[in-house]
């Protein structure tokens, strides 16, 4: 078999809200994924397993199960929304995120996916991970995901 | 439906003070910030400041610290600027805008006219 | 403070033409960190306050008519008109919404030749 290629392309959007009373703050961040599939039979897309981290600490998981099916040397862009809570132990970062002083609020989370492919009974999994500057002060739409050069730190080794 | 209503036309002398409003409804007041923007006739738009109803924190321009004043009461849903040491330099239609927090300028008032002449 | 430019100051068209109007930046207002420019773009009819057409630099509000596109980065925008309506007219402002204290052009009127 050839390799499936997985490649994480960044942020599509981050909607904010926000709880005063609890000091919480709420980020639903859809990212885009292109899975590539490199040999001459189809791939089943199982399952995307996500989650997100803020200063280690995980902030926000999802799953996505039965996604699609991908032909022979076919790529798909699949984009897949993390809802995440910023709020308890962290909730001094409500603070930063509504500052009335700056307009810029960016914070660093760390994107973390699993990609679940299945082929002829056999399951492979292929993960990735990838740091994203967010602004947690107001929403932001792309009309195209970031592309990777975008991305701020290098994926863990 | 989302409105914010400003009070009517005022007319002063110079070295008053005016306190203008701009009356919220249709969504929940505390949740938005309230700006302020002044628009000298036949010019372009400055920022004065802004206010979070929530908490009262406000962030001005340096160019009105001194000048205006932001305040709001929660119980009316009601912002207010106050403008203070009138000249002529002041005469303006003056705007509230919201924002939902640091998101852009969603939502205008229809302005307030200040006219300050002897 | 962030000064913004805008030409030309004034445009005169005929309907159904297309228009484009520059608005530049004394400082980028590009967030370098999720690579979104926080420029917007506000529409002025005659006798009434501001509307927003467009944030981001190119994401048009909600009920914007698709004639509408915003472009560029950095300290370069543009606004740009593809068929050009009765109802288009009036003045047009950029903003930056990248820093305090939040900074307007002084317009581009567009008027009915």
């Known amino acids: 078999p050839r390799s499936i290629e997985v490649k994480y392309i960044g942020v599509k959007s981050a909607y904010v809200s926000y709880d005063a009373e609890k000091r919480t703050i709420y980020l639903n961040i859809t990212n885009t994924l292109n899975i590539t599939n490199n040999n001459y039979y189809s791939v089943e897309v199982e399952n995307i397993t996500a989650q997100v981290q803020f200063s280690k600490t995980v902030i926000g998981k999802a799953r996505l199960n039965n996604i699609t099916n991908i032909g022979p040397l076919d790529m798909k862009q699949i984009d897949y929304t993390v809802p995440t809570v910023i709020a308890e132990e962290m909730s001094y970062m409500y603070d930063f995120c509504t500052l009335l002083s700056i307009k810029v609020h960016n914070i660093v989370l760390m994107m973390q996916v699993t990609v679940t492919t299945a082929y002829f009974g056999h399951s492979e999994q292929i993960s990735q991970e990838r740091y994203q500057y967010v602004d947690c002060g107001r929403n932001t739409t792309y009309q195209l995901a970031q592309s990777e050069y975008l991305n701020v730190l290098q994926p863990q080794q | 439906e989302v409105q914010l209503q400003q009070s009517g036309p005022v007319l002063v002398k110079p070295g008053a003070s005016v306190k203008m409003s701009c009356k919220a409804s249709?969504?929940?007041?505390?949740?938005?910030?309230i700006h302020w923007v002044k628009q000298s006739h036949g010019r372009s738009l400055e920022w004065i400041g802004v206010i979070s109803p929530y908490n009262d924190n406000t962030n001005y321009n340096q160019k009105f610290k001194g000048k205006a004043t932001l305040t709001v009461d929660k119980s009316s849903s009601t912002a207010y600027m106050e403008l203070n040491s009138l000249t002529s330099e002041d005469s303006a239609v003056y705007y509230c805008v919201r924002t939902y927090y640091s998101n852009y300028f969603d939502y205008w008032g229809q302005g307030t006219t200040l006219t300050v002449s002897s | 403070d962030i000064v913004m430019t805008q030409s030309p100051s004034s445009l005169s068209v005929s309907a159904g033409e297309k228009v484009t109007m520059s608005c530049k930046s004394s400082q980028s207002l590009l967030n370098s960190g999720n690579q979104k420019n926080y420029l917007a773009w506000h529409q002025q009819r005659p006798g009434q306050p501001p509307k927003l057409l467009i944030y981001?630099?190119?994401t048009r509000e909600s009920g914007v008519p698709d004639r509408f596109t915003g472009s560029g980065s950095g300290t370069e925008f543009t606004l740009t008109i593809s068929s050009v309506q009765a109802e288009d007219l009036a003045v047009y402002y950029c903003?930056?919404?990248?820093?305090?204290?939040?900074?307007f052009g002084a317009g581009t009127k567009l008027e009915l030749k």
């Open positions: 981001g630099a190119s």
């Open positions: 903003q930056n919404d990248h820093s305090y204290p939040l900074t």
């Open positions: 249709g969504y929940t007041f505390t949740d938005y910030y």
